[in-house]
């Protein structure tokens, strides 16, 4: 028979107030015959937590049937954990003897400490939108965790980021800790549908990290590109001019037409479409009456996007004599 080993697999056990803690202890041999006891602490002042042989321990239950000779699992559960329960717990084998049992071997001990889960990470983006190719900062905060050791990672669309700084406070001993991390993210034109994720891993989470997210759509402004074109076909005495506003975000947009510098009040037809990347296209049609027009008509499509300075595109209308004749012919 191999020499008895007392196995306490966890060096550290984090528990939550009010919950039940399981302290594991297994033996590698059924010899020598004798009881297993649990103590908190070492030396003469150690506190008896459980004695399989005798005594009343209302908060302690055993994981397996300790009355059986062939039992090798001496794990216990302690219910209704309080801060007073913290300490190092030892599983100790005794050899049957008289007048008292003789201590034979102790396990290495399991430190029980109070653990607190971190709060769900909150990710905050920049206060103002920024255009692609620029860098924006996101902050992630999580609070109330213990112990202090914690891992925080940043991801953009599943790809881990490396440009971030993290602080855990306070630096000294505390009941609970907070983490704050700031990541720098370079915006891409297609980031309207992108997400940044802050992932927090802590021992209390048992391998299931907490995540906080922020949508880059809240941080990005993709400015539009403008194109004004004259349609080759005319309708009666009118020429159709199109202003195409492409690839912009957010949707907030004001478009105005001007004829030779005069803002036109009349309504125009328009359509808004959403692109796969989350940006928008806006197409506006402007009908110009050419029957009484001179040759030098200049149309301007002016766009004010998301409160930014207006951008505009001009088009000098081409109206041939033939077109004029046609239009006057068509006029009743």
């Amino acid at each position: 028979e191999e020499e008895l080993q007392m196995i306490q697999p966890e060096k550290l056990l984090l528990v939550t107030v009010g919950k039940t803690a399981t302290l594991h202890c297994t033996v590698t041999s059924l010899l020598p015959v004798g009881p297993v006891l649990w103590f908190r602490g070492v030396g003469p002042g150690r506190e008896l937590i459980y004695n399989q042989k005798e005594g009343h321990f209302p908060r302690v239950t055993t994981v397996s049937d300790l009355t059986k000779r062939n039992n090798m699992d001496f794990s216990i559960r302690i219910s209704s954990i309080t801060p007073a329960d913290v300490g190092t717990y030892y599983c100790v084998k005794f050899r049957k003897g008289s007048p008292e049992d003789v201590e034979f071997k102790s396990g290495p001990g399991t430190e029980m400490a109070l653990g607190a889960k971190p709060s769900a990470p909150v990710v905050l983006g920049p206060a103002a939108r920024t255009t692609p190719e620029h860098t924006v900062s996101f902050t992630c905060e999580s609070h109330g965790f213990s112990p202090r050791d914690i891992t925080l990672k940043w991801f953009k669309n599943g790809n881990e980021l490396s440009d971030f700084q993290t602080n855990v406070d306070p630096t000294g001993q505390s009941v609970a800790y907070s983490i704050r991390s700031t990541a720098r993210v370079v915006l891409d034109p297609w980031d309207v549908r992108s997400q940044v994720i802050c992932e927090v891993a802590h021992v209390t989470l048992q391998g299931d990290p907490l995540r906080g997210t922020a949508n880059l759509s809240e941080a990005i402004r993709v400015p539009p590109t403008l194109e004004v074109t004259q349609q080759p076909m005319r309708v009666g005495n009118q020429v159709n001019v199109t202003c195409q506003v492409r690839k912009f975000y957010p949707q907030s947009l004001q478009l105005t037409w001007s004829e030779n510098g005069n803002v036109c009040q009349r309504e125009t037809a328009s359509t808004l479409t959403e692109n796969k990347d989350g940006t928008y296209n806006w197409t506006s049609w402007f009908l110009v009456n050419i029957s009484d027009q001179r040759d030098d008509v200049v149309l301007t499509c002016q766009v004010k996007h998301d409160g930014q300075l207006a951008v505009s595109k001009r088009l000098a209308l081409e109206v041939t004599v033939h077109q004029k004749d046609q239009s006057s012919d068509a006029t009743p």
């Epitope: 004798g34 059986k68 000779r69 062939n70 007048p99």
Partner: antibody, heavy 118, light 107 residues
């Protein structure tokens, strides 16, 4: 069902030999210490021998050197080889399992009678 | 060897009585003491181990106490099936030894 069944008892002359068997079932035989206990007619119980899970054996002075306890875990069997039998060895022989954590007996067989007489 | 002495050797009692049997060890045996019940022609039955722990399936009318050298077995309310011979046994060290028995008879 946990069970112990002894066999091999009978009538033997003084100086003779006998081998008792105990068939175990319903539990992991190799994980328990096993004992023999005897009881002469109208008398009290007397512990005869033990074989531990590691094969270690112990006997009282009254049978030491004459009796040998052994076990065959693969067959879930316990044996007691009794040599140089005396009239005073006449008794019902029980096998018992040291089934409690502290090796207290928890299960007993029904017993087998050994009579040593000329 | 450790000597175990039971008293009384025999005891008469009536149905419903509470009876106590004592067992004394010749030296300290901690609390490694067991109690057994035996009926005529039958194998012993385990009742109590570690002085006060009830074996599985044993009714709670049986109780044990004691530590060191002096131990007791108490049967709280005698029923017809309880009339038998009772043995104590020390199992702190080899050779394990039994008391001489206490015969509990119906009055």
């Amino acid at each position: 069902e946990v069970q112990l069944v002894e066999s091999g008892g009978g009538l033997v002359q003084p100086g003779g030999s006998l081998r008792l068997s105990c068939a175990a079932s319903g539990f992991t035989f190799s994980s328990y210490d096993m004992h023999w206990v005897r009881q002469a007619t109208g008398k009290g119980l007397e512990w005869v021998s033990v074989i531990g899970i590691a094969g270690d054996t112990y006997y009282p002075g009254s049978v030491k050197g004459r009796f040998t306890i052994s076990r065959e875990n693969a067959k879930n069997s316990l044996y007691l080889q009794m040599n140089s039998l005396r009239v005073g060895d006449t008794a019902v022989y029980y096998c018992a399992r040291g089934g409690s954590w502290d090796d207290a007996f928890d299960i007993w067989g029904q017993g087998t009678m050994v009579t040593v007489s000329s | 060897d450790i000597q175990m002495t039971q008293s009384p050797s025999s005891l008469s009692a009536s149905i419903g009585d509470k009876v106590t049997i004592t067992c004394r060890a010749s030296q300290d045996i901690n609390n490694y003491l067991a109690w057994f019940q035996q009926k005529p022609g039958k194998a012993p039955k385990s009742l109590i181990y570690t002085a006060s722990s009830l074996q599985s399936g044993v009714p709670s009318k049986f109780s044990g106490s004691g530590s060191g050298t002096d131990f007791t077995l108490t049967i709280s309310s005698l029923q017809p099936e309880d009339f038998a011979t009772y043995y104590c046994q020390q199992y702190v060290s080899y050779p394990y030894t039994f008391g001489q028995g206490t015969k509990l008879e119906i009055k």
